[in-house]
Protein backbone atom coordinates (compact mmCIF):
# COMPACT_ATOMS: atom_id res chain seq x y z
CA UNK A 1 0.00 0.00 0.00
CA UNK A 2 1.19 3.55 -0.67
CA UNK A 3 1.91 5.72 2.35
CA UNK A 4 -1.19 7.56 3.53
CA UNK A 5 0.95 9.67 5.84
CA UNK A 6 4.13 11.65 5.53
CA UNK A 7 7.65 10.33 6.16
CA UNK A 8 9.33 10.55 9.58
CA UNK A 9 10.79 14.04 9.38
CA UNK A 10 7.81 15.55 7.57
CA UNK A 11 4.45 17.06 8.48
CA UNK A 12 1.22 17.44 6.53
CA UNK A 13 0.03 20.90 5.55
CA UNK A 14 -2.28 21.88 2.69
CA UNK A 15 -2.12 18.31 1.32
CA UNK A 16 1.69 18.53 1.09
CA UNK A 17 4.27 16.62 3.07
CA UNK A 18 6.79 19.26 4.13
CA UNK A 19 10.13 18.80 5.81
CA UNK A 20 10.20 19.68 9.49
CA UNK A 21 12.81 22.18 10.64
CA UNK A 22 15.86 20.61 12.21
CA UNK A 23 16.78 21.18 15.87
CA UNK A 24 18.09 24.71 16.38
CA UNK A 25 15.81 26.18 13.72
CA UNK A 26 12.24 27.52 13.67
CA UNK A 27 9.62 27.50 10.93
CA UNK A 28 9.28 30.64 8.82
CA UNK A 29 7.04 29.29 6.05
CA UNK A 30 5.52 25.95 5.06
CA UNK A 31 6.55 24.27 1.85
CA UNK A 32 4.28 24.16 -1.18
CA UNK A 33 4.38 21.83 -4.16
CA UNK A 34 7.11 24.03 -5.61
CA UNK A 35 8.85 25.70 -2.68
CA UNK A 36 10.76 24.30 0.29
CA UNK A 37 10.02 24.62 3.97
CA UNK A 38 11.76 27.79 5.13
CA UNK A 39 13.52 27.58 8.49
CA UNK A 40 15.65 30.08 10.39
CA UNK A 41 18.20 29.49 13.17
CA UNK A 42 17.10 30.32 16.70
CA UNK A 43 18.49 33.58 18.08
CA UNK A 44 20.95 34.11 20.90
CA UNK A 45 19.56 32.69 24.18
CA UNK A 46 16.96 30.61 22.30
CA UNK A 47 16.71 26.92 21.42
CA UNK A 48 14.60 24.16 19.86
CA UNK A 49 15.70 20.64 20.73
CA UNK A 50 13.59 18.56 18.32
CA UNK A 51 12.63 18.38 14.63
CA UNK A 52 9.76 20.84 14.66
CA UNK A 53 7.32 23.19 12.98
CA UNK A 54 7.44 25.79 15.76
CA UNK A 55 7.26 29.42 14.68
CA UNK A 56 9.03 30.57 17.87
CA UNK A 57 12.11 29.19 19.60
CA UNK A 58 12.07 28.58 23.36
CA UNK A 59 14.01 30.89 25.69
CA UNK A 60 16.97 29.38 27.48
CA UNK A 61 16.33 28.78 31.17
CA UNK A 62 17.66 31.55 33.44
CA UNK A 63 19.70 30.34 36.40
CA UNK A 64 18.67 32.95 38.97
CA UNK A 65 21.45 33.52 41.53
CA UNK A 66 18.83 34.95 43.92
CA UNK A 67 17.39 31.42 44.08
CA UNK A 68 20.83 29.93 44.66
CA UNK A 69 21.18 28.79 41.03
CA UNK A 70 24.19 28.83 38.72
CA UNK A 71 24.84 27.61 35.17
CA UNK A 72 26.05 24.03 34.98
CA UNK A 73 25.94 23.83 31.17
CA UNK A 74 25.38 26.76 28.83
CA UNK A 75 22.52 26.31 26.37
CA UNK A 76 23.00 26.09 22.60
CA UNK A 77 20.54 26.59 19.72
CA UNK A 78 19.62 22.91 20.17
CA UNK A 79 19.76 22.51 23.97
CA UNK A 80 18.42 24.34 26.99
CA UNK A 81 20.68 25.76 29.69
CA UNK A 82 21.17 23.36 32.61
CA UNK A 83 21.13 24.95 36.08
CA UNK A 84 22.58 23.58 39.26
CA UNK A 85 22.82 24.90 42.81
CA UNK A 86 25.55 26.82 44.57
CA UNK A 87 27.77 25.03 47.10
CA UNK A 88 25.79 23.84 50.12
CA UNK A 89 22.48 23.86 48.25
CA UNK A 90 20.57 21.35 46.10
CA UNK A 91 17.68 21.46 43.62
CA UNK A 92 14.10 21.17 44.85
CA UNK A 93 12.98 19.39 41.65
CA UNK A 94 14.31 17.60 38.59
CA UNK A 95 13.97 20.78 36.54
CA UNK A 96 16.05 22.62 39.19
CA UNK A 97 14.05 25.81 39.43
CA UNK A 98 15.15 26.66 42.97
CA UNK A 99 17.56 25.51 45.66
CA UNK A 100 17.43 24.69 49.36
CA UNK A 101 20.25 24.06 51.84
CA UNK A 102 21.47 20.50 52.29
CA UNK A 103 19.99 18.88 55.37
CA UNK A 104 22.23 17.73 58.21
CA UNK A 105 22.08 14.30 59.74
CA UNK A 106 21.05 14.54 63.40
CA UNK A 107 22.93 12.85 66.25
CA UNK A 108 22.34 9.11 65.99
CA UNK A 109 22.45 9.36 62.19
CA UNK A 110 25.39 9.51 59.81
CA UNK A 111 25.81 10.63 56.22
CA UNK A 112 25.24 7.75 53.79
CA UNK A 113 25.60 9.93 50.69
CA UNK A 114 26.92 13.47 50.64
CA UNK A 115 24.60 15.96 48.91
CA UNK A 116 25.33 17.26 45.40
CA UNK A 117 23.95 20.23 43.50
CA UNK A 118 21.01 18.10 42.49
CA UNK A 119 20.46 15.72 45.41
CA UNK A 120 20.04 16.15 49.15
CA UNK A 121 22.09 14.51 51.89
CA UNK A 122 21.07 10.91 52.53
CA UNK A 123 21.24 9.93 56.21
CA UNK A 124 21.26 6.49 57.77
CA UNK A 125 20.79 5.40 61.42
CA UNK A 126 24.05 4.46 63.08
CA UNK A 127 24.06 0.68 63.51
CA UNK A 128 25.19 -1.09 66.69
CA UNK A 129 28.90 -0.43 67.16
CA UNK A 130 28.72 3.05 65.56
CA UNK A 131 27.66 6.50 66.73
CA UNK A 132 27.31 10.12 65.69
CA UNK A 133 27.14 12.84 68.33
CA UNK A 134 26.94 15.81 65.94
CA UNK A 135 24.46 17.32 63.51
CA UNK A 136 26.39 17.27 60.22
CA UNK A 137 25.96 17.17 56.45
CA UNK A 138 29.32 15.42 56.01
CA UNK A 139 30.09 13.15 58.97
CA UNK A 140 29.52 9.40 58.72
CA UNK A 141 28.73 7.21 61.73
CA UNK A 142 31.99 6.50 63.56
CA UNK A 143 32.88 3.19 65.21
CA UNK A 144 32.87 2.96 68.96
CA UNK A 145 36.29 3.12 70.50
CA UNK A 146 37.79 -0.30 70.98
CA UNK A 147 38.75 -0.27 74.69
CA UNK A 148 40.51 -3.64 74.37
CA UNK A 149 43.11 -2.36 71.96
CA UNK A 150 44.02 0.28 74.51
CA UNK A 151 44.19 -2.29 77.28
CA UNK A 152 41.14 -0.70 78.83
CA UNK A 153 37.66 -1.91 79.64
CA UNK A 154 34.24 -0.51 78.83
CA UNK A 155 33.00 1.53 81.73
CA UNK A 156 29.95 2.91 79.94
CA UNK A 157 28.30 1.30 76.92
CA UNK A 158 28.07 3.23 73.70
CA UNK A 159 24.81 4.23 72.00
CA UNK A 160 24.01 5.45 68.50
CA UNK A 161 24.72 8.96 69.81
CA UNK A 162 27.61 8.38 72.19
CA UNK A 163 30.91 6.61 72.17
CA UNK A 164 31.78 4.00 74.76
CA UNK A 165 33.62 5.22 77.84
CA UNK A 166 36.77 3.25 78.54
CA UNK A 167 38.43 2.93 81.91
CA UNK A 168 41.26 1.05 83.61
CA UNK A 169 40.79 -2.61 84.46
CA UNK A 170 40.11 -3.34 88.18
CA UNK A 171 43.24 -5.06 89.58
CA UNK A 172 42.19 -7.54 92.24
CA UNK A 173 44.71 -9.15 94.60
Amino acid sequence: EPPTACREKQYLINSQCCSLCQPGQKLVSDCTEFTETECLPCGESEFLDTWNRETRCHQHKYCDPNLGLRVQQKGTSETDTICTCEEGLHCTSESCESCVPHRSCLPGFGVKQIATGVSDTICEPCPVGFFSNVSSAFEKCRPWTSCETKDLVVQQAGTNKTDVVCGPQDRQR
Epitope: P2, C6, K9, Q22, T37
Partner: antibody, heavy 121, light 107 residues
Framework: QVQLVQSGAEVKKPGASVKVSCKAS????????MHWVRQAPGQGLEWMGW????????NFAQQFQGRVTMTRDTSISTAYMEVSRLRSDDTAVFYC??????????????WGQGTLVTVSS | DIQMTQSPSSLSASVGDILTITCRAS??????LNWYQQKPGKAPNLLIS???RLRSGVPSRFSGSGSGTDFTLTISSLQPVDFTTFYC?????????FGQGTKVEIK
Amino acid sequence: QVQLVQSGAEVKKPGASVKVSCKASGYTFAGYYMHWVRQAPGQGLEWMGWINPDSGGTNFAQQFQGRVTMTRDTSISTAYMEVSRLRSDDTAVFYCAREKITMTGIYFDYWGQGTLVTVSS
Amino acid sequence: DIQMTQSPSSLSASVGDILTITCRASQNITTYLNWYQQKPGKAPNLLISAASRLRSGVPSRFSGSGSGTDFTLTISSLQPVDFTTFYCQQTFTTPWTFGQGTKVEIK
Protein backbone atom coordinates in the same frame (compact mmCIF):
# COMPACT_ATOMS: atom_id res chain seq x y z
CA GLN B 1 16.78 26.39 -5.10
CA VAL B 2 16.94 22.61 -4.82
CA GLN B 3 19.89 20.98 -6.54
CA LEU B 4 21.16 17.41 -6.69
CA VAL B 5 24.71 17.30 -8.00
CA GLN B 6 26.21 13.91 -8.80
CA SER B 7 29.83 12.78 -9.09
CA GLY B 8 31.52 12.45 -12.46
CA ALA B 9 31.64 9.60 -14.96
CA GLU B 10 33.56 6.44 -14.01
CA VAL B 11 35.21 3.64 -15.98
CA LYS B 12 35.57 0.38 -14.07
CA LYS B 13 36.78 -3.14 -14.73
CA PRO B 14 34.47 -6.15 -14.24
CA GLY B 15 34.53 -7.33 -10.62
CA ALA B 16 35.37 -3.88 -9.27
CA SER B 17 33.08 -1.58 -7.25
CA VAL B 18 31.86 1.93 -7.95
CA LYS B 19 30.49 4.52 -5.54
CA VAL B 20 28.38 7.36 -6.94
CA SER B 21 27.63 10.44 -4.83
CA CYS B 22 24.68 12.82 -4.89
CA LYS B 23 25.11 16.13 -3.05
CA ALA B 24 21.87 17.86 -2.10
CA SER B 25 21.40 21.58 -1.50
CA GLY B 26 18.54 24.03 -1.18
CA TYR B 27 16.46 21.95 1.24
CA THR B 28 16.64 19.98 4.50
CA PHE B 29 18.46 16.82 3.40
CA ALA B 30 17.15 14.58 6.21
CA GLY B 31 13.56 15.57 5.45
CA TYR B 32 13.11 13.73 2.15
CA TYR B 33 13.84 10.16 1.02
CA MET B 34 16.39 9.82 -1.79
CA HIS B 35 15.91 7.28 -4.57
CA TRP B 36 18.27 5.85 -7.18
CA VAL B 37 17.32 4.99 -10.76
CA ARG B 38 19.39 3.12 -13.34
CA GLN B 39 19.26 3.58 -17.11
CA ALA B 40 21.28 1.28 -19.36
CA PRO B 41 22.34 2.73 -22.75
CA GLY B 42 19.31 3.10 -25.02
CA GLN B 43 17.09 1.47 -22.39
CA GLY B 44 14.34 2.55 -20.03
CA LEU B 45 14.37 3.69 -16.41
CA GLU B 46 14.77 1.12 -13.62
CA TRP B 47 14.04 1.93 -9.96
CA MET B 48 16.82 0.63 -7.69
CA GLY B 49 15.69 1.65 -4.21
CA TRP B 50 15.58 4.41 -1.63
CA ILE B 51 17.44 5.60 1.44
CA ASN B 52 15.98 7.45 4.40
CA PRO B 53 18.69 10.11 4.96
CA ASP B 54 17.63 10.60 8.56
CA SER B 55 17.91 7.01 9.79
CA GLY B 56 19.96 5.44 7.00
CA GLY B 57 17.22 2.84 6.43
CA THR B 58 16.99 1.44 2.89
CA ASN B 59 14.60 -0.41 0.59
CA PHE B 60 15.83 -2.11 -2.60
CA ALA B 61 14.29 -3.63 -5.70
CA GLN B 62 14.96 -7.37 -5.47
CA GLN B 63 17.39 -7.50 -8.39
CA PHE B 64 19.69 -5.01 -6.61
CA GLN B 65 19.65 -6.60 -3.17
CA GLY B 66 23.04 -7.87 -2.01
CA ARG B 67 25.13 -6.06 -4.62
CA VAL B 68 23.98 -2.48 -4.06
CA THR B 69 24.62 -0.41 -0.92
CA MET B 70 23.04 2.96 -0.21
CA THR B 71 24.52 5.21 2.46
CA ARG B 72 24.48 8.87 3.38
CA ASP B 73 26.50 11.51 5.22
CA THR B 74 24.07 14.01 6.72
CA SER B 75 26.90 16.36 7.75
CA ILE B 76 27.56 17.11 4.07
CA SER B 77 24.01 16.41 2.75
CA THR B 78 25.25 13.66 0.46
CA ALA B 79 23.76 10.30 -0.51
CA TYR B 80 25.90 7.48 -1.93
CA MET B 81 25.09 4.43 -4.01
CA GLU B 82 27.69 1.69 -4.37
CA VAL B 83 27.54 -1.25 -6.76
CA SER B 84 29.94 -4.12 -6.11
CA ARG B 85 31.08 -7.02 -8.31
CA LEU B 86 30.47 -4.97 -11.45
CA ARG B 87 29.57 -6.73 -14.69
CA SER B 88 29.59 -5.35 -18.22
CA ASP B 89 25.77 -5.19 -18.20
CA ASP B 90 25.98 -2.75 -15.26
CA THR B 91 27.11 -0.08 -17.73
CA ALA B 92 24.47 2.61 -17.22
CA VAL B 93 23.65 6.13 -16.17
CA PHE B 94 22.69 6.26 -12.49
CA TYR B 95 20.37 9.02 -11.25
CA CYS B 96 19.51 10.14 -7.74
CA ALA B 97 16.02 11.60 -7.34
CA ARG B 98 14.21 13.23 -4.45
CA GLU B 99 10.83 11.86 -3.38
CA LYS B 100 7.89 14.19 -2.89
CA ILE B 101 4.68 13.06 -1.19
CA THR B 102 1.34 14.81 -1.47
CA MET B 103 -2.03 13.46 -0.40
CA THR B 104 -2.81 12.73 -4.05
CA GLY B 105 0.43 11.09 -5.11
CA ILE B 106 4.13 10.37 -4.78
CA TYR B 107 6.68 11.38 -7.38
CA PHE B 108 10.26 12.48 -8.04
CA ASP B 109 10.36 16.26 -8.13
CA TYR B 110 14.12 16.77 -8.46
CA TRP B 111 16.74 14.63 -10.21
CA GLY B 112 20.52 14.65 -10.29
CA GLN B 113 22.20 15.15 -13.67
CA GLY B 114 23.16 11.47 -13.85
CA THR B 115 26.48 9.63 -13.56
CA LEU B 116 27.65 7.38 -16.39
CA VAL B 117 29.38 4.23 -15.16
CA THR B 118 31.13 2.22 -17.88
CA VAL B 119 32.19 -1.33 -17.05
CA SER B 120 34.79 -2.57 -19.51
CA SER B 121 37.82 -4.83 -19.43
CA ASP C 1 5.94 -6.66 -8.67
CA ILE C 2 3.60 -4.40 -10.62
CA GLN C 3 4.33 -4.44 -14.37
CA MET C 4 3.79 -1.22 -16.30
CA THR C 5 3.14 -1.72 -20.03
CA GLN C 6 3.41 1.36 -22.20
CA SER C 7 2.21 1.55 -25.76
CA PRO C 8 3.27 2.24 -28.34
CA SER C 9 6.99 1.82 -27.66
CA SER C 10 7.71 4.26 -30.49
CA LEU C 11 5.73 6.33 -32.94
CA SER C 12 6.18 8.87 -35.72
CA ALA C 13 4.11 12.04 -35.72
CA SER C 14 4.08 15.56 -37.10
CA VAL C 15 4.10 18.97 -35.44
CA GLY C 16 0.53 19.90 -34.50
CA ASP C 17 -0.67 16.30 -34.20
CA ILE C 18 -2.68 15.04 -31.25
CA LEU C 19 -0.76 12.28 -29.51
CA THR C 20 -2.00 9.64 -27.08
CA ILE C 21 0.27 7.31 -25.10
CA THR C 22 -1.23 4.63 -22.90
CA CYS C 23 0.09 2.88 -19.82
CA ARG C 24 -1.42 -0.25 -18.30
CA ALA C 25 -0.67 -1.52 -14.79
CA SER C 26 -0.75 -5.24 -14.00
CA GLN C 27 -2.91 -4.48 -10.94
CA ASN C 28 -4.95 -1.64 -9.51
CA ILE C 29 -2.73 1.33 -8.60
CA THR C 30 -5.61 3.80 -8.03
CA THR C 31 -4.07 7.10 -9.24
CA TYR C 32 -0.48 6.58 -8.09
CA LEU C 33 0.75 7.14 -11.65
CA ASN C 34 3.26 9.72 -12.90
CA TRP C 35 4.39 10.74 -16.38
CA TYR C 36 7.94 11.93 -17.10
CA GLN C 37 9.56 13.35 -20.21
CA GLN C 38 13.23 12.61 -20.91
CA LYS C 39 15.30 14.51 -23.45
CA PRO C 40 18.49 12.86 -24.80
CA GLY C 41 21.38 13.04 -22.34
CA LYS C 42 19.20 14.62 -19.63
CA ALA C 43 17.45 13.47 -16.48
CA PRO C 44 13.71 12.81 -16.67
CA ASN C 45 11.37 15.69 -15.89
CA LEU C 46 7.99 15.32 -14.20
CA LEU C 47 5.00 16.30 -16.36
CA ILE C 48 2.03 14.84 -14.50
CA SER C 49 1.56 13.32 -11.03
CA ALA C 50 -1.40 11.46 -9.52
CA ALA C 51 -2.54 10.45 -13.04
CA SER C 52 -3.88 13.86 -13.95
CA ARG C 53 -2.22 16.68 -11.95
CA LEU C 54 -0.23 18.88 -14.32
CA ARG C 55 3.02 20.05 -12.77
CA SER C 56 3.39 23.83 -12.56
CA GLY C 57 5.38 25.17 -15.51
CA VAL C 58 4.43 22.26 -17.77
CA PRO C 59 2.59 23.44 -20.94
CA SER C 60 -1.18 22.95 -20.91
CA ARG C 61 -1.03 20.87 -24.10
CA PHE C 62 -0.10 17.97 -21.83
CA SER C 63 -2.87 16.19 -19.95
CA GLY C 64 -3.29 12.90 -18.13
CA SER C 65 -6.25 10.72 -17.30
CA GLY C 66 -7.17 7.31 -15.94
CA SER C 67 -7.34 5.36 -12.70
CA GLY C 68 -7.06 1.77 -11.57
CA THR C 69 -5.08 0.03 -14.30
CA ASP C 70 -5.47 2.13 -17.48
CA PHE C 71 -3.87 5.54 -17.96
CA THR C 72 -3.38 7.97 -20.82
CA LEU C 73 -1.01 10.84 -21.58
CA THR C 74 -2.32 13.18 -24.26
CA ILE C 75 -0.43 15.93 -26.09
CA SER C 76 -3.03 18.12 -27.78
CA SER C 77 -0.73 19.75 -30.35
CA LEU C 78 2.77 18.32 -30.74
CA GLN C 79 5.56 20.89 -30.68
CA PRO C 80 9.16 20.39 -31.93
CA VAL C 81 10.43 20.12 -28.33
CA ASP C 82 8.07 17.19 -27.68
CA PHE C 83 9.95 14.75 -29.92
CA THR C 84 11.54 12.92 -27.01
CA THR C 85 10.81 9.90 -24.79
CA PHE C 86 7.98 9.61 -22.27
CA TYR C 87 7.75 7.23 -19.28
CA CYS C 88 4.94 6.29 -16.92
CA GLN C 89 5.76 5.28 -13.33
CA GLN C 90 3.71 3.68 -10.56
CA THR C 91 4.38 4.64 -6.94
CA PHE C 92 1.54 2.61 -5.43
CA THR C 93 3.86 0.01 -3.95
CA THR C 94 7.56 -0.84 -3.95
CA PRO C 95 9.35 -1.74 -6.06
CA TRP C 96 8.28 1.37 -7.90
CA THR C 97 8.26 0.53 -11.58
CA PHE C 98 8.44 2.42 -14.89
CA GLY C 99 6.93 1.64 -18.23
CA GLN C 100 9.45 0.76 -20.94
CA GLY C 101 9.09 4.22 -22.53
CA THR C 102 7.55 5.70 -25.66
CA LYS C 103 9.90 7.37 -28.13
CA VAL C 104 8.20 10.06 -30.23
CA GLU C 105 9.93 10.75 -33.54
CA ILE C 106 9.26 13.26 -36.31
CA LYS C 107 7.44 11.81 -39.30
